[in-house]
């Protein structure tokens, strides 16, 4: 999606099928207020952005309302009347789902079910990553809805969990973004903890009677 024209790099993110953010990085125009012009229909006249993003006092992007659209964004980034970058993109291929909300944990012996609010569209994967201080890397499990059960946990260990949402590549293609991670939550013996110790505490020696 980057593509350079006159040294302009662009990035498109379609936040949760709600808002499209187009940002640009144009070293040649770093002290210039470039303008953003767009349309959702190839036959219409361009509209100018009304919600610019600023970086060091100069325009660096545009936010557009685009509720549940599955069509092409035609856009032109201009220096005055001179187009410095013109392109068209299918917005949905740059989807970034929103971060999971209302994350809940339900423990039953050596298993936990992680739930959260499902998003209002489909073909998503809800991924839970978890680890204990004994683990060298995060382990992962994902499902098509935000109802993920992880089994075989050690009740005595402290585990850190976080959750995110990903768009299925088979449907949305390879250029989407995963959601931001939810906050890390730590659990031990079915109870929430402030944190898991970074280094596992050695087992206490058994005292002989």
């Amino acid at each position: 999606q980057g593509g350079a024209a006159e040294g302009v790099q662009i990035q498109i993110i379609y936040f949760n099928l709600e808002t499209v953010q187009v940002t640009w990085n144009a070293s040649k125009y770093s002290r210039t207020n470039l303008t953003f012009h767009y349309r959702f229909n190839g036959d219409e006249a361009y509209d100018q952005c009304t919600n610019y993003l600023l970086q060091e006092g100069h325009t660096s992007g545009c936010l557009l309302d685009a509720e549940q659209r599955d069509d092409i964004l035609y856009f032109s980034i201009r220096n005055g009347t001179h187009p410095v970058f013109t392109a068209s993109r299918w917005m949905v291929y740059y989807l970034k789902p929103s971060s999971p909300k209302h994350v809940r944990f339900s423990w039953h012996q050596d298993a936990v079910t992680v739930t959260c609010s499902d998003l209002s569209y489909g073909d998503l994967l809800y991924e839970v990553q978890y680890r204990s201080p004994f683990d060298t890397e995060w382990q992962s499990k994902q499902e098509n809805t935000c109802n993920v059960t992880i089994e075989g946990l050690d009740a005595e260990k402290c585990y850190s969990f976080w959750v995110r949402v990903k768009a299925m590549e088979d449907v949305y293609g390879p250029d989407t973004y995963p959601s931001d991670w939810s906050e890390v939550t730590c659990w031990q013996r079915g109870e929430i903890r402030d944190a898991c110790a970074e280094t596992p505490t050695p087992p206490k020696p058994k005292l002989s009677k």
């Epitope: 099928l17 229909n41 190839g42 549940q68 659209r69 599955d70 069509d71 092409i72 299918w90 949905v92 291929y93 989807l95 499902d118 998003l119 209002s120 569209y121 489909g122 073909d123 098509n144 809805t145 935000c146 109802n147 299925m168 088979d170 449907v171 949305y172 293609g173």
Partner: antibody
């Protein structure tokens, strides 16, 4: 609003091929949305077959993918469903429709075209 | 694949009756469910999407509810033109699947 008209149905022998067409009007199939085929066997329920997105990407029902191919002709604003190695159980009314990625429900439908696979 | 099971498969009702059709998914599908009405020889028509949102032009007597695995289509006061077959459909994950249909007949 978009209008969809299917054609190409008829009687075909098992093992043979058939190509269905769906002509869209009032909306360019390259401008947006997904363009699915859905079928319905006589007296039975509905089954999603495949779709082609306006970008050209395709997705299929895994149970049919090896035999069915979805395509389009942009200049004619027309979708196609190529069906190979047809079987008696492919006998159905085939509908084209419009949906969108992430929200794959079917808001607009054609009138359907009947395919009968019989010797 | 996700199975969508509708009940009843058919029902008889009179004009003015309140009619409820249920659809059960074999696993959670969030709120990603649509409902359609189909009359003999015609293409289906979208009634409800996202479990509870009426499609444009659909009369207010049609309503949908539910999330997860259990969904309901309600016709608050059955009209003569409502005698038809109704289908639910999940679009939470492909392959997108439909219920087997519920035929609403005149009593």
């Amino acid at each position: 609003q978009v209008q969809l008209v299917e054609s190409g149905g008829g009687v075909v022998q098992p093992g043979r091929s058939l190509r269905l067409s769906c002509a869209a009007s009032n909306y360019s199939i390259t401008s947006g949305y997904s363009w699915p085929w859905v079928r319905q066997a006589p007296g039975k329920g509905l089954e999603w077959v495949a779709y082609i997105h306006s970008s050209g990407r395709t997705n299929y029902n895994p149970s049919l993918k090896s035999r069915f191919t979805i395509s389009r002709d942009n200049s004619k604003n027309t979708l196609y469903l190529q069906m190979n190695s047809l079987r008696a159980e492919d006998t159905a009314v085939y509908y084209c429709a419009r949906s969108q990625l992430g929200l794959v429900f079917f808001a607009y439908w054609g009138q359907g075209t009947l395919v009968t696979v019989s010797s | 694949d996700i199975q969508m099971t509708q009940s009843p498969s058919s029902l008889s009702a009179s004009v003015g009756d309140r009619v409820t059709i249920t659809c059960k998914a074999s696993q959670s599908v969030g709120a990603n469910v649509a409902w359609y009405q189909q009359k003999p020889g015609k293409a289906p028509k979208l009634l409800i999407y996202s479990a509870s949102y009426r499609f444009s032009g659909v009369p207010s007597r049609f309503s949908g509810s539910g999330s997860g695995t259990d969904f309901t289509l309600t016709i608050s006061s059955l009209q003569p033109e409502d005698f038809a077959t109704y289908y639910c459909q999940q679009y939470n994950s492909y392959p997108y699947t439909f219920g087997q249909g519920t035929k609403v007949e005149i009593k």
